[in-house]
Interface confidence: medium
């Protein structure tokens, strides 16, 4: 059954863009006019999970690539990774739990909480050129993003 997908660019609240740096890593950095088109476009799928007034379960794929953000336990710590998937199978409305994020809208910003690991969020560092990671909203890490809609 076809699944509803929308396409977005994400920037953290410091206006850092997200860029695919090596085949399986996202980094956050400020882009200028010339290289603005380097930022990734996310395909957001609306998937199985528990929606509520403030949380919507979504999966985040990279448009044009068979890659999805997923959350797994590595060395005892919830970890964000880019996972390669079979394009004939994905996206689907019932994604494995590791692919599911609760999209939480806070004022004009949005946060992405791991469904597998509650209170762990897609995060960026204050510093430039650092990997996007899964953080537990501690210290100076950034968990608030803005979404810019991209026409399909």
């Amino acid at each position: 059954v076809p699944i509803r997908q929308l396409h977005y660019r994400l920037r953290d609240e410091q206006q850092k863009s997200l860029v695919l740096s090596d085949p399986y890593e996202l980094k956050a950095l400020h882009l200028n006019g010339q290289n603005i088109n380097q930022q990734v476009i996310f395909s957001m799928s609306f998937v199985q999970g528990e929606p509520s007034n403030d949380k919507i379960p979504v999966a985040l794929g990279l448009k044009g690539k068979n890659l999805y953000l997923s959350c797994v336990m590595k060395d005892g710590t919830p970890t964000l990774q880019l996972e390669s998937v079979d394009p004939k199978q994905y996206p689907k409305k019932k994604m494995e739990k590791r692919f599911v994020f609760n999209k939480i809208e806070v004022k004009s910003k949005v946060e992405f909480e791991s469904a597998e690991f509650p209170n762990w969020y897609i995060s960026t560092s204050q510093a430039e050129h650092k990997p996007v990671f899964l953080g537990n909203n501690s210290g100076q890490d950034i968990i608030d993003f803005t979404m810019e809609s991209v026409s399909s």
Partner: antibody, heavy 119, light 106 residues
């Protein structure tokens, strides 16, 4: 309050086609998936397939070659057809709604229709 | 086809705890659901998304899911909990029920 009311022929001969319809009363039709499940006498539940309001379907691979699920959004109804039935298809057939608020699982069920296949 | 395996029956004394297991390959990667079915009635959803309870379902029903096993737990079992219980999950593009477990209240 959502209600699913189902009907169809209860007695079939082998090789005939089973045909059931489920009408949905209350709630939006387009916001959900609509499923058929069956239960042979004294046995467990078996998922047959699902459809959305646009007519897109998923079927159980073991039944796929014989099953057709269709939808009539103007009447808020969906239907099941199962061809070339045998005695093994004797079961109570249920229609059900899959809702996003329960994680796309079956939260409302019809009353069930016993279909007997016998020569 | 994907298989979800449940014990055929579980026997429990009133007021005790009944645990029903459902095992399947990497079931913990997916969401598990549980239905209660009494004789002559349609199934009723008692647990969804591993551990959530629909409104109207008593607190004594709880669920968990990790590894290859989902578990439905009924704490302080009552006579009215005597029924068949089915686990339910998905396998790629289709849905699968477990074989069902009959809970007998001794």
């Amino acid at each position: 309050q959502v209600q699913l009311q189902q009907w169809g022929a209860g007695l079939l001969k082998p090789s005939e086609t089973l045909s059931l319809t489920c009408a949905v009363y209350g709630g939006s039709f387009s916001d959900y998936y609509w499923s058929w499940i069956r239960q042979p006498p004294g046995k467990g539940l078996e998922w047959i397939g699902e459809i959305d309001h646009s007519g897109s379907t998923n079927y159980n691979p073991s039944l796929k070659s014989r099953v057709t699920i269709s939808v009539d959004t103007s009447k808020n109804q969906f239907s099941l057809k199962l061809s070339s039935v045998t005695a093994a298809d004797t079961a109570v057939y249920y229609c059900a709604r899959a809702s996003p608020s329960s994680g796309w699982t079956l939260d409302y069920w019809g009353q069930g229709t016993l279909v007997t296949v016998s020569s | 086809q994907s298989v979800l395996t449940q014990p055929p029956s579980v026997s429990v004394s009133p007021g005790q705890t009944a645990s029903i297991t459902c095992s399947g390959d990497k079931l913990g990667d997916k969401f598990a659901f549980w239905y209660q079915q009494k004789p002559g009635q349609s199934p009723v959803l008692v647990i969804y998304l591993d551990n959530k309870r629909p409104s109207g379902i008593p607190e004594r029903f709880s669920g968990s899911n990790s590894g290859n096993t989902a578990t439905l737990t009924i704490s302080g079992t009552q006579a009215l909990d005597e029924a068949d219980y089915y686990c339910y999950a998905w396998a790629d593009t289709y849905e699968v029920f477990g074989g069902g477990t009959k809970v007998d209240i001794k």
